[in-house]
C-alpha cells in the first residue's frame, strides 16, 4: 500500500497500486545539506554520492556517545524521502550530500555558508543539469545566510528549505526567511498543521507552501533495510525538493520563478484548518499543500500569479510597508490591508528599475501590509498611470490609454487621514472596464500592461449590507491579477488575493452599523494570455 | 518573505574612519553594521563572518583579513582566519575577541559583520 504522504502529493491520474509517475527526476541533481548519511541503505544505494564536504561543530555534553546510526538518522531519512526506491518522491533523482550538521543535528551559519559556497564552486567547475539544494535546517534570522541563498538562487539554483519546527513566524528564522528560497511548512494526514511536542510547524508570509511532514516513512540508519517514521518541516521540504526535481526533469529550462509559481498553482488549495495558526497569521499563511502536476508538460499556457505579502509596517504615522516580486516576475497589481482599518492606501512605484508595492499607514493605525500580485508574463511591458486627486464630485479616474495596453490592477493612495467617512460611494460608470475609479481625494494608480495575447476583464461582486468579507473569483481559464475595493466604503480594512479569489475585508459589522456606506464591492481583474495558450498548443 | 532589512536584532556600530593610518579608509559617511542572532542561546560569540562589499575581489578579501590580523596583533589580540569566502559572497570567517569588532567594522570594503550562530535539523 502506498504511504499516505506519497498518495497526498500524487494527482489521481497517477494513483495506481504503485507510486510511479513518469520520469523520476533523473535529469536533476539534489544537494542535501544535513547530517552524515548511510549511503549503503537499500533505499538510496547508488543514488546518493557522499561528498567530502564536512563542516560541523563539536557535539555538546560530556556524556554524548557518537553512535553511527544516530549521526546518520536525519540525513538518511531525508535522502530516502527525496529519492528512495520504495518511499521516495523522485525515484530517479541523484543526490549529493554535504555534512553541515553534527550527530546531535546541530550546525552553524558559517558551516552552512561554506557548504553553499562549495555547491556554487562545484557548479562552476562542472556544470550539470538543473540543481536543487535542500536545506532541512533552521537558525535565527541571519542576514548573511539569506544573502548567500539569494546569490545561489540568482545563479540558477533552486533552494528548498524547512520553515522550522518552532510554531512561530518563519520570518524570524533563516534560511526560511530568504525570499529566494522555497520555504515549506508541514501538514499531516488530515491536512492539519503539524504539532511536534509543545511546538509545531512554523507559519506566516515567509512560508511558500506546506507539504506532508508528519509520520513520514523513510530510510532508517538503524540498518540497511530498516525504515522509520520521522516528522518535521525537514520532511515537508524533502517532499517539495522531490516534486521540484520531477518538474525540472520534465522541463529543465524552468526558472526559479516559474517553478515556484507552478508549485503554488498545482497545490491543493484551502484544505488546511487555519484555526491552528495564531489569528494575526492566518491571512498571511498560504493555505496550500504541495502536489505533483497532473501532467509533467503543458502548463506553459497558463498565466501564473501569486500573492506576496510585505512585512508589517509598524504603527508610526508615516510607516510604510513594501512588497516585492521576484526578479523574473511582473508586479501586476498592488493592494493593502490593515487590521485597524486605518491606512492611507497603496501605490506602485519604481525602485531600482523594478516596480514595488508600497502601503501607507495612517495616524492612529496599528500598521499596514502591502500585498503584491506577482505574475509570470513573458515579453511584458508594464507601466503605472497615475491620476492625482480630482476634487470633483465624480471621483478620481485613470485608464490605460496606450494602444494595446490592458488594465491589470488598480491602487489608490490618499494623504487625508480618514478618507470618505462622510462621503457617498463613487460608482464606476458602466462600459468602461479599462479604467480605475477612486475617491476624489485619492490619487489613483492603474497598472497597464502590454504582452502578446494578453486580455483582461473586470469582475465585481457587491453586497449592499455590511459584511465582514466580500469575495469575487475569476472563472476557469482566467487568472486573478488585480484585487481592490470599490471606493466609498470607509470601513474597508483592505483587499488581497487568495489564489484566484479577490477578498475585500471590512470592519466587524457590529461596530459599523448598516448605513449607506455599508455597501462593499470587491473588484477583481481577471486576465489570460492567448499567446501562451497558442505557444503551448504549438509545442504539443 | 523577509526583506534584508527585516525583523532581526541589529546592532549598528556607527564608526568614523579615523582608524590608525588606514591606507584605504571606508568611503565617507558609510558605516558597516554588526548583526547577531536575536535568540541568545543560539549565539556563537568569538566567531564572525565579515562580509565585504559586493564587487570585492578575492585578493582584496585576503588583504583585508590580513590587515585585521595585523591590527589585532598590534593591540595584543590573537585572531585566526578560518575561511576566506569567494564564489557566493566576498568575505572571511574569523575567530577573534568581540573587543575587535569596532576595529573590524572600520576596515576597507566591509559591508557588515555577523556573529556566527547555531542552526538545527528540523
Amino acid at each position: 500500500s502506498i504511504p499516505w504522504n506519497l498518495e497526498r502529493i500524487t494527482p489521481p491520474r497517477y494513483r495506481a497500486d504503485e507510486y510511479q509517475p513518469p520520469d523520476g527526476g533523473s535529469l536533476v541533481e539534489v544537494y542535501l545539506l544535513d547530517t552524515s548519511i548511510q549511503s549503503d541503505h537499500r533505499e538510496i544505494e547508488g543514488r546518493v554520492m557522499v561528498t567530502d564536504f564536512e563542516n560541523v561543530p563539536e557535539e555538546d555534553g560530556t556524556r554524548f556517545h557518537r553512535q553511527a546510526s544516530k549521526c546518520d538518522s536525519h540525513g538518511t531519512h531525508l535522502a530516502g524521502v527525496v529519492s528512495g526506491r520504495d518511499a521516495g518522491v523522485a525515484k530517479g533523482a541523484s543526490m549529493r550530500s554535504l555534512r553541515v550538521l553534527n550527530c546531535q543535528g546541530k550546525g552553524t551559519v558559517s558551516g552552512t555558508l561554506i557548504g553553499l559556497e562549495f555547491i556554487r564552486k562545484s557548479q562552476l567547475v562542472q556544470p550539470v543539469g538543473p540543481l536543487v539544494v535542500l536545506l532541512p535546517l533552521a537558525g535565527g534570522y541571519s542576514r548573511v545566510l539569506n544573502a548567500a541563498c539569494q546569490r545561489l538562487a540568482r545563479a540558477g539554483v533552486v533552494l528548498v528549505t524547512a520553515a522550522g519546527n518552532f510554531r512561530d513566524d518563519a520570518c524570524l528564522y533563516s534560511p526560511a526567511s530568504a525570499p529566494e528560497v522555497i520555504t515549506v511548512g508541514a501538514t499531516n494526514a488530515q491536512d492539519q498543521p503539524v504539532t511536534l511536542g509543545t511546538l509545531g510547524t512554523n507559519f506566516g508570509r515567509c512560508v511558500d507552501l506546506f507539504a506532508p511532514g508528519e509520520d513520514i516513512i523513510g530510510a532508517s540508519s538503524d540498518c540497511s533495510t530498516c525504515f522509520v517514521s520521522q516528522s518535521g518541516t525537514s520532511q515537508a521540504a524533502a517532499h517539495v525538493a522531490g516534486i521540484a526535481a520531477m518538474m525540472l526533469s520534465a522541463e529543465p529550462e524552468l526558472t526559479l520563478a516559474e517553478l515556484r509559481q507552478r508549485l503554488i498553482h498545482f497545490s491543493a488549495k484551502d484544505v488546511i484548518n487555519e484555526a491552528w495558526f495564531p489569528e494575526d497569521q492566518r491571512v498571511l499563511t498560504p493555505n496550500l499543500v504541495a502536489a505533483l502536476p497532473p501532467s509533467t508538460h503543458g502548463a506553459g499556457w497558463q498565466l501564473f500569479c501569486r500573492t506576496v505579502w510585505s512585512a508589517h509596517s509598524g504603527p508610526t504615522r508615516m510607516a510604510t510597508a513594501v512588497a516585492r516580486c521576484a526578479p523574473d516576475e511582473e508586479l501586476l497589481s498592488c493592494s493593502s490591508f490593515s487590521r485597524s482599518g486605518k491606512r492611507r492606501g497603496e501605490r506602485m512605484e519604481a525602485q531600482g528599475g523594478k516596480l514595488v508595492c508600497r502601503a501607507h499607514n495612517a495616524f492612529g493605525g496599528e500598521g499596514v501590509y502591502a500585498i503584491a500580485r506577482c505574475c509570470l508574463l513573458p515579453q511584458a511591458n508594464c507601466s503605472v498611470h497615475t491620476a492625482p486627486p480630482a476634487e470633483a464630485s465624480m471621483g478620481t479616474r485613470v485608464h490605460c490609454h496606450q494602444q494595446g495596453h490592458v488594465l491589470t490592477g488598480c491602487s489608490s493612495h490618499w494623504e487625508v487621514e480618514d478618507l470618505g467617512t462622510h462621503k457617498p460611494p463613487v460608482l464606476r460608470p458602466r462600459g468602461q472596464p479599462n479604467q480605475c475609479v477612486g475617491h476624489r481625494e485619492a490619487s489613483i494608480h492603474a497598472s497597464c500592461c502590454h504582452a502578446p495575447g494578453l486580455e483582461c476583464k473586470v469582475k465585481e461582486h457587491g453586497i449592499p449590507a455590511p459584511q465582514e468579507q466580500v469575495t469575487v473569483a475569476c472563472e476557469e481559464g482566467w487568472t486573478l491579477t488585480g484585487c481592490s475595493a470599490l471606493p466609498g466604503t470607509s470601513h474597508v480594512l483592505g483587499a488581497y488575493a487568495v489564489d484566484n479569489t479577490c477578498v475585500v475585508r471590512s470592519r466587524d459589522v457590529s461596530t459599523t452599523g448598516s448605513t449607506s456606506e455599508g455597501a462593499v464591492t470587491a473588484v477583481a481583474i481577471c486576465c489570460r494570455s492567448r499567446h501562451l495558450a497558442q505557444a503551448s498548443q504549438e509545442l504539443q | 518573505q523577509e526583506d534584508e532589512d527585516g525583523d532581526y536584532e541589529e546592532l549598528v556600530l556607527a564608526l568614523r574612519s579615523e582608524e590608525d593610518g588606514l591606507a584605504e579608509a571606508p568611503e565617507h559617511g558609510t558605516t558597516a553594521t554588526f548583526h547577531r542572532c536575536a535568540k541568545d542561546p543560539w549565539r556563537l560569540p568569538g566567531t564572525y563572518v565579515v562580509v565585504l562589499k559586493e564587487e570585492t575581489h578575492l585578493s582584496q578579501s585576503e588583504r583585508t583579513a590580513r590587515r585585521l590580523q595585523a591590527q589585532a596583533a598590534r593591540r595584543g589580540y590573537l585572531t585566526k582566519i578560518l575561511h576566506v569566502f569567494h564564489g557566493l559572497l566576498p568575505g572571511f570567517l574569523v575567530k577573534m575577541s568581540g573587543d575587535l569588532l569596532e576595529l573590524a567594522l572600520k576596515l576597507p570594503h566591509v559591508d557588515y559583520i555577523e556573529e556566527d550562530s547555531s542552526v538545527f535539523a528540523q
Epitope: 504511504p3 536525519h74 546531535q104 543535528g105 519546527n165 532508517s220 538503524d222 525504515f227 520521522q230 | -
Partner: antibody, heavy 130, light 107 residues
C-alpha cells in the same frame, strides 16, 4: 492497508514453551515499534512487551521478564514472542499491535512522539493448563 | 510502575446521551494517554492519542481531554455502535499500562 496476522497459539502444559508469530504486510512494518498485548478471559488488556524497529531495544512487563523474549525479522516482515516457563496465569488471547510513533528533532536532540497502537491483529489464544 | 485507574467500571446509558469516562494515573504522564474501544471477540481500536487527538476515521462525537494525572473520554451523543468496553493506556515511557476498562452498556 497494513494487516497483522498472529499464529502459534495453542494448549500447553505449565512450564512448557510456545512461540507466537505475527506476519505483517508492507514496508510500514519495519518502520514502527511493535507490541504484544494479552487479554485473559473476561479480563482487561495487559501490555506484554515491545520492540524497536531494528530490534535493538526491547521492554517487558515485570511479570514476564526472563521468561518471554520479543524479536522481529525485518526480511520476513514478522514479529515473534518466545514464551518459556509458561504459567496458568499466562492464559490469554495474545494480540500483536503496531506502535505508531514518530521521531522529530528538537534543538540538538531527537524526540519520540507516540500515537498509540493503531493496527491490531485478530489475536491468537494461548491456554496453559495441565 | 505507573498504575491507571478507570471509573466507573460499568456505565449504563441510552442512545443520544452524553457520557464521560475518567482515567487517573498514579503519577504525572503529561499528555501521553490513549483511549481504545473494544467490542466482544474483537481486537481493540484506537480512538484518541496524546490525550485529545482524534485518530483518523474516528467519529467526531468522541473527544478526549486532560493532562498530568486526570483524563476524560467524552462521547457527545451515544450511538448504538458505541456500546463497548473502553480502555485508557499510558505511554509515558517505553513500557505501557492499561486501565482496567469501563463497560458501556445500554440502559
Amino acid at each position: 492497508e497494513v494487516q497483522l496476522v498472529e499464529s502459534g497459539g495453542g494448549l500447553v502444559q505449565p512450564g512448557g514453551s510456545l512461540r507466537l508469530s505475527c506476519a505483517a504486510s508492507g514496508i510500514t512494518f519495519s518502520s514502527y515499534w511493535m507490541s504484544w498485548v494479552r487479554q485473559a478471559p473476561g479480563k482487561g488488556l495487559e501490555w506484554v512487551a515491545n520492540i524497536k524497529q531494528d530490534g535493538s531495544e526491547k521492554y517487558y512487563v515485570d511479570s514476564v521478564k526472563g521468561r518471554f523474549t520479543i524479536s522481529r525479522d525485518i526480511a520476513k516482515n514478522s514479529l515473534y514472542l518466545q514464551m518459556n516457563s509458561l504459567r496458568a496465569e499466562d492464559t490469554a488471547v495474545y494480540y500483536c499491535a503496531r506502535d505508531r510513533g514518530t521521531y522529530y528533532t528538537g534543538m540538538g536532540e531527537y524526540n519520540y512522539y507516540y500515537y498509540g497502537m493503531d493496527v491490531w491483529g485478530q489475536g491468537t489464544t494461548v491456554t496453559v493448563s495441565s | 510502575d505507573i498504575q491507571m485507574t478507570q471509573s466507573p467500571s460499568t456505565l449504563s446509558a441510552s442512545v443520544g446521551d452524553r457520557v464521560t469516562i475518567t482515567c487517573r494515573a498514579s503519577q504525572s504522564i503529561s499528555s501521553w494517554l490513549a483511549w481504545y474501544q473494544q467490542k466482544p471477540g474483537k481486537a481493540p481500536k484506537l480512538l484518541i492519542y496524546k490525550a485529545s487527538s482524534l485518530e483518523s476515521g474516528v467519529p467526531s462525537r468522541f473527544s478526549g481531554s486532560g493532562s498530568g494525572t486526570e483524563f476524560t473520554l467524552t462521547i457527545s451523543s451515544l450511538q448504538p455502535d458505541d456500546f463497548a468496553t473502553y480502555y485508557c493506556q499510558q505511554y509515558n515511557s517505553y513500557s505501557y499500562t492499561f486501565g482496567q476498562g469501563t463497560k458501556l452498556e445500554i440502559k
